[in-house]
């Protein structure tokens, strides 16, 4: 399939001009190669009419140009002084020959309609309304006023001042006068359809002294806006239908031959094909709303329409807006698994792609919720604290520059199954959707921490061990301390007397972490894990409680606190000693259906920027060391 995209059909009238935009994939070669516009003719030949190399055919001499916009990955063909002879089939394309990558465009040039010289032309969009102004002389003020629609043989009544209304205009046509002005009457026709287009005659009075006015009503289908998006990226349909439908239910549908199948509406309907990757967001009281679709698939390409009607379904005579969506399969967005599987008690690591040109953008992870219009509350972000209910089991690992950040969720339960979105406050196209499936665990995890009821005594030495199988012998082992700003990996070198040490006993294949002496700040969640370079392997989590020696009572751990976790991380965690200042933007985040909301979270999260100081609050550093004895069994 060609990755070139443009308007399938372009319509104009004789003497007018057209501007045709064609899109191409974002590559250096494409930006610099020849662009052309050719006309399809006999024996499958396509005759060049204009190209970016400077060629201009005699048919187009003085009336056409072609401009390349490499920064937008588009080129535009402008043609003026159109004639009916220009009606035909064309191609816009890229390449040294006209057999290169191209897109078929039909150009329709209609005759200028022959209208009586005094005809007033009204041009309106489908679903809108028109108010036709009908002037008359004072002597016809007491006479009957009417509007009729011309057919070949006669003029069919639409409405008159005696309250006669044509059945097809009942509830849509109103004849009225404004104030005390006795020289004009008005006819308003609402919910316009294609069938309403045509010639009308306004009349006041009868016979030769009657006042008549010719009216040409043109009812236009909206021009589809072209959207060129990459496979796996996201698209936002911004729908602005006007204040008059502000209180009606809204919908987005996709054209399917003669019908338009609803994908989502504000009454709760949603196409199962879009489960987990769609949101509809009312913008304001002026009838504006947007629909966001992530994880674009090639079958999502097509003709979309948004509208408003109390039924939440497409209805003739109601305002609409349309788009033609093209999904470019030569995507810059890497092909990642869209389904991630985990087991209860285990964990998952999700690699989220982002635009590598925007490494400093703020990264987020949200959970898609389908109730109502759908929303995606943020669970964690680079500068956003982890939501309370995910304490100890969720972290975002950002490694700026490589185009991926990783999210780890552990201590999984079946309730964690669902759809999650990766998003940033930068390039919105890079929003991706992941479905998390959680099955019941059927075997022991690879990593196990002892003791499982970990209560350390203040001032004493406390050791926890992480047991791992021999298959992990060549991988690096680590411990990290979790906080609601990330999981801070303990440094791999000694930094002072008060130290945490990590050692590996080759016979029992374990990594031990020692806190010596135990301080109150040591209380909290710790993760033990394995990794290879920047690719993180499995992990398990443990909660270490700290008690004073005299207390004697055992510490109550959080529910499921020490459930074991399995993860596969792909990035090194960054330092997360972030100020404890509350992040006000996160507790009740919006659905993130538009950039502004993400930006707001991002702006407020600036307060919580990592300080870069890996030290503990009292200035004493923690450290750990790791010895690997590779022992084969």
């Amino acid at each position: 399939k060609s990755p070139i995209f443009g308007p399938q059909e372009v319509s104009s009238i004789e003497g007018d001009s057209v501007s045709i935009t064609c899109y191409y994939p974002d590559t250096s070669v494409n930006r610099h190669t020849r662009k052309y516009w050719c006309r399809q003719g006999a024996s499958g030949m396509c005759t060049t009419l204009i190209s970016s190399n400077g060629y201009l055919s005699k048919e187009y001499s003085g009336r056409a140009n072609l401009i390349n916009f490499p920064e937008n990955n588009t080129f535009v063909i402008n043609i003026e002084q159109l004639t009916q002879d220009d009606t035909g089939s064309y191609k816009c394309g890229l390449g040294t020959s006209n057999r290169g990558l191209s897109f078929d465009v039909s150009l329709e040039v209609s005759q200028v309609p022959e209208l009586p010289s005094d005809t007033h032309v009204y041009t309106k969009d489908i679903g809108r309304n028109v108010t036709i102004e009908c002037p008359f002389k004072r002597e016809n003020a007491p006479s009957k006023k009417s509007l009729c629609k011309k057919t070949n043989q006669s003029c069919e009544l639409v409405i008159d001042s005696t309250e006669k209304v044509n059945p097809s205009y009942i509830g849509r046509a109103k004849l009225f006068m404004k104030g005390t002005d006795l020289t004009v009457f008005y006819v308003n026709i609402s919910h316009l359809t294609h069938n309403d287009a045509g010639l009308y005659i306004c009349q006041a009075g009868e016979g030769p002294s009657a006042d008549k006015k010719n009216v040409d009503l043109q009812v236009l289908a909206p021009e589809p806006e072209l959207l060129y998006k990459d496979l796996r990226s996201s698209v936002t349909f911004e729908c602005d239908l006007g204040r008059e439908v502000a209180n009606e239910a809204k919908y987005l549908c996709r054209m399917n031959k003669e019908t338009c199948d609803v994908i989502i509406n504000t009454l709760g309907k949603r196409d199962p094909d879009f489960e987990g990757r769609i949101l509809i967001t009312p913008k304001d009281d002026n009838g504006r709303f947007s629909v966001l679709i992530t994880g674009l698939r090639k079958e999502d390409a097509g003709h979309y329409q948004c509208g408003a009607h109390s039924s939440g379904l497409p209805q003739e005579g109601w305002p609409i807006q349309t788009w033609q969506l093209f999904v470019n399969e030569e995507s810059t967005i890497p092909n990642r698994r869209s389904v991630v599987k985990g087991v209860t008690g285990g964990s998952v690591a999700i690699a989220c792609p982002y635009n590598p040109k925007e490494s400093s953008s703020l990264k987020y992870w949200c959970r898609w919720e389908g109730d109502g219009n759908g929303h995606c509350p943020v669970l964690v972000g680079t500068q956003a604290q982890v939501q309370e209910e995910y304490e100890g089991r969720l972290a975002l690992f950002d490694q700026p520059g490589n185009g991926t950040y990783t999210v780890i969720l552990n201590q999984l339960t079946t309730e964690d199954a669902g759809f999650y979105w990766c998003l940033t406050n930068g390039d919105s196209r890079w929003r991706t959707t992941i479905e998390l499936q959680v099955a019941e665990a059927t075997r022991e995890p690879n990593l196990e921490v002892t003791p499982q009821n970990a209560t350390a005594v203040l001032g004493e030495t406390f050791t926890v061990s992480c047991h791992y199988p021999c298959k992990f012998y060549s991988q690096e082992k680590y411990w990290c301390k979790w906080s609601n700003k990330g999981c801070h990996i303990l440094p791999s070198h000694d930094e002072g007397a008060r130290q945490s040490s990590v050692s590996c006993d080759q016979s029992s294949q374990l990594v031990s972490m020692t806190l010596n002496p135990v301080s109150k700040e040591d209380e909290g969640w710790y993760w033990c894990g394995v990794k290879q370079g920047q690719t993180y392997g499995e992990t398990t989590a443990i909660y270490i409680a700290v008690e004073e020696r005299t207390r004697g009572s055992s510490h109550v751990n959080p529910t499921d606190a020490n459930a074991r976790a399995k993860v596969a991380l792909e990035e090194e965690v960054v330092d997360s000693s972030i100020s404890e200042k509350e992040n006000k933007a996160i507790p009740n985040p919006g659905p993130f259906a538009n950039e502004r909301e993400i930006q707001n979270v991002g702006d407020q999260a600036q307060e919580n920027r990592a300080s870069g100081d890996a030290g503990s609050a009292d200035g004493q550093s923690r450290s750990s060391s790791s010895k690997h004895h590779h022992h084969h069994h």
Epitope: E9, R39, A42, D85, G88, S89
Partner: nanobody, 119 residues
Framework: QVQLVESGGGLAQAGGSLTLSCAAS????????MGWYRQTPGNSREFVAR???????HYADSVTGRFTLSRTQDKNTVSLQMNSLKPDDTGVYYC?????????????WGQGTQVTVSS
């Protein structure tokens, strides 16, 4: 040279249906656009519908929603399905085929087929 043969005209009641067909032969491979025009009593020939080589269809406002134009896989035959016919639709319907020669547009026309809609 392109030859166009029309069929399917006749008499129909208002609200009824008719289907017109047009088969192209000769150098039909180069046809760019195919469609229908009509000449109604007392009027000049007017555009009804056409289909382009990329399967895009265009209709006159007066027939939008009532008439449907389609074509066969080999692109050499077009059919005009006319529903909800009105007396105004009465006239002679002409098949049209357009070819771009590489430098000019050439239009070919059929002989015409009569459609009469009675009220």
């Amino acid at each position: 040279q392109v030859q166009l043969v029309e069929s399917g005209g006749g008499l129909a009641q208002a609200g009824g249906s008719l289907t017109l067909s047009c088969a192209a032969s000769g150098t039909a491979a180069g046809i760019d656009v195919m469609g229908w025009y009509r000449q109604t009593p007392g009027n000049s020939r007017e555009f009804v519908a056409r289909i382009f080589s990329n399967d895009v269809t265009h209709y006159a406002d007066s027939v939008t929603g009532r008439f449907t134009l389609s074509r066969t896989q080999d692109k050499n035959t077009v059919s005009l399905q006319m529903n909800s016919l009105k007396p105004d639709d009465t006239g002679v319907y002409y098949c049209n085929a357009r070819i771009w020669t590489g430098s000019t547009t050439v239009d070919y026309w059929g002989q015409g087929t009569q459609v009469t809609v009675s009220s």
